[in-house]
Interface confidence: medium
């Protein structure tokens, strides 16, 4: 996971950061650009049909530390990366799906405890 450009210096992050957004664009966004006081993110996750869908957007400063932490979710494959170093920095983020569990390659029903 990347959180490039993070710094303890208060001047390191611009007051308003512009991010590329797709499927997470607020109503007031223009040309697929949103603005935030927090982070830009790009996320890859399997949709309900197992297709690896990429979305991107803005995260507010409040709570973004937690959201940018890639905590595994049971039975869901997803990965998120965040950045703050420049406008539209999330264009260059490239999160990758965590590997499939071996049980997905065994014929027969799955039994969850």
């Amino acid at each position: 996971k990347k959180e490039d450009g993070e710094s303890t210096a208060p001047t390191a992050r611009p007051k308003v950061l512009r991010c590329k957004c797709h499927h997470h664009c607020p109503e007031d966004s223009v040309n697929n650009i949103c603005s935030t006081d927090g982070y830009c993110f790009t996320m890859i996750e399997e949709d309900d049909s197992g297709t690896p869908v990429v979305t991107s957007g803005c995260l507010g400063l409040e709570g973004s530390d937690f959201q940018c932490r890639d905590t595994p979710i049971p039975h869901q494959r997803r990965s998120i990366e965040c950045c703050t170093e420049r406008n539209e920095c999330n264009k260059d983020l490239h999160p990758t799906l965590p590997p499939l569990k071996d049980r997905d390659f065994v014929d027969g029903p799955i039994h969850h405890k």
């Epitope: 797709h22 399997e46 297709t51 690896p52 869908v53 990429v54 499939l100 997905d104 014929d107 799955i110």
Partner: antibody
Framework: QVQLQQPGAELVKPGASVKLSCKAS????????MHWVKQRPGRGLEWIGR????????KYNEKFKSKATLTVDKPSSTACMQLSSLTSEDSAVYYC?????????WGTGTTVTVSS | DIVMTQSQKFMSTSVGDRVSVTCKAS??????VFWYQQKPGQSPKALIY???YRYSGVPDRFTGSGSGTDFTLTISNVQSEDLADYFC?????????FGDGTKLELR
């Protein structure tokens, strides 16, 4: 190894129906959705629809809603597509394709020929 | 429906060349694009997902790029086994739609 096996060819008469099969092996059948794609020579690829083998839930391309019916048989790990009221426009190669994240596997394809 | 346009139906190349196959979406699809390779008499084979992610086992001479509406599949150091049809597909919204394909031929 993930594999999708399809019969090589089907010859059917105009107006008739045909049921195409796609047998999956090498993975847990119910965890990967199955897509169906049509290919005619010089006409590129067309997405027909997809089915969730676990629930049987389907999503169709409007264009094929009255033409194709997708089903699954879980015990045999087989997905099926029934094509109805066949015309020469339905003569094509039909592929099943299974996708899960960074795995993407296509069947061998069934050539359907509609001819009297 | 989203239309995927591959304006070049044929592209001529030589072994060792670098070639770029392009695909244009009729509306913004983010990076939700697949690239497929198809050889005569064979099923399509997935090369790239999410516009730039290479499937495992795909040689690193295949590179996908682009976002929004413009996408490119670049093959550097073309090999004779790369001569095939290449299709893009968007999966940002239903129905999923494909480009008409670009045939890569030997010059």
């Amino acid at each position: 190894q993930v594999q999708l096996q399809q019969p090589g060819a089907e010859l059917v008469k105009p107006g008739a129906s045909v049921k195409l099969s796609c047998k999956a092996s090498g993975y847990t059948f119910t965890t990967y959705w199955m897509h169906w794609v049509k290919q005619r020579p010089g006409r590129g690829l067309e997405w027909i629809g997809r089915i969730d083998p676990n629930s049987g839930g389907t999503k169709y391309n409007e264009k094929f809603k009255s033409k194709a019916t997708l089903t699954v048989d879980k015990p045999s790990s087989t997905a099926c597509m029934q094509l109805s009221s066949l015309t020469s426009e339905d003569s094509a190669v039909y592929y099943c394709a299974s996708r899960r994240g960074d795995i993407d596997v296509w069947g061998t394809g069934t050539t359907v020929t509609v001819s009297s | 429906d989203i239309v995927m346009t591959q304006s070049q139906k044929f592209m001529s190349t030589s072994v060792g060349d670098r070639v770029s196959v392009t695909c244009k979406a009729s509306q913004n699809v983010g990076t939700n694009v697949f690239w497929y390779q198809q050889k005569p008499g064979q099923s399509p084979k997935a090369l790239i997902y999410a516009a730039s992610y290479r499937y495992s086992g795909v040689p690193d001479r295949f590179t996908g790029s682009g976002s929004g509406t413009d996408f490119t599949l670049t093959i550097s150091n073309v090999q004779s086994e790369d001569l095939a049809d290449y299709f893009c597909q968007q999966y940002d919204s239903y129905p999923l739609t494909f480009g008409d394909g670009t045939k890569l031929e030997l010059r």
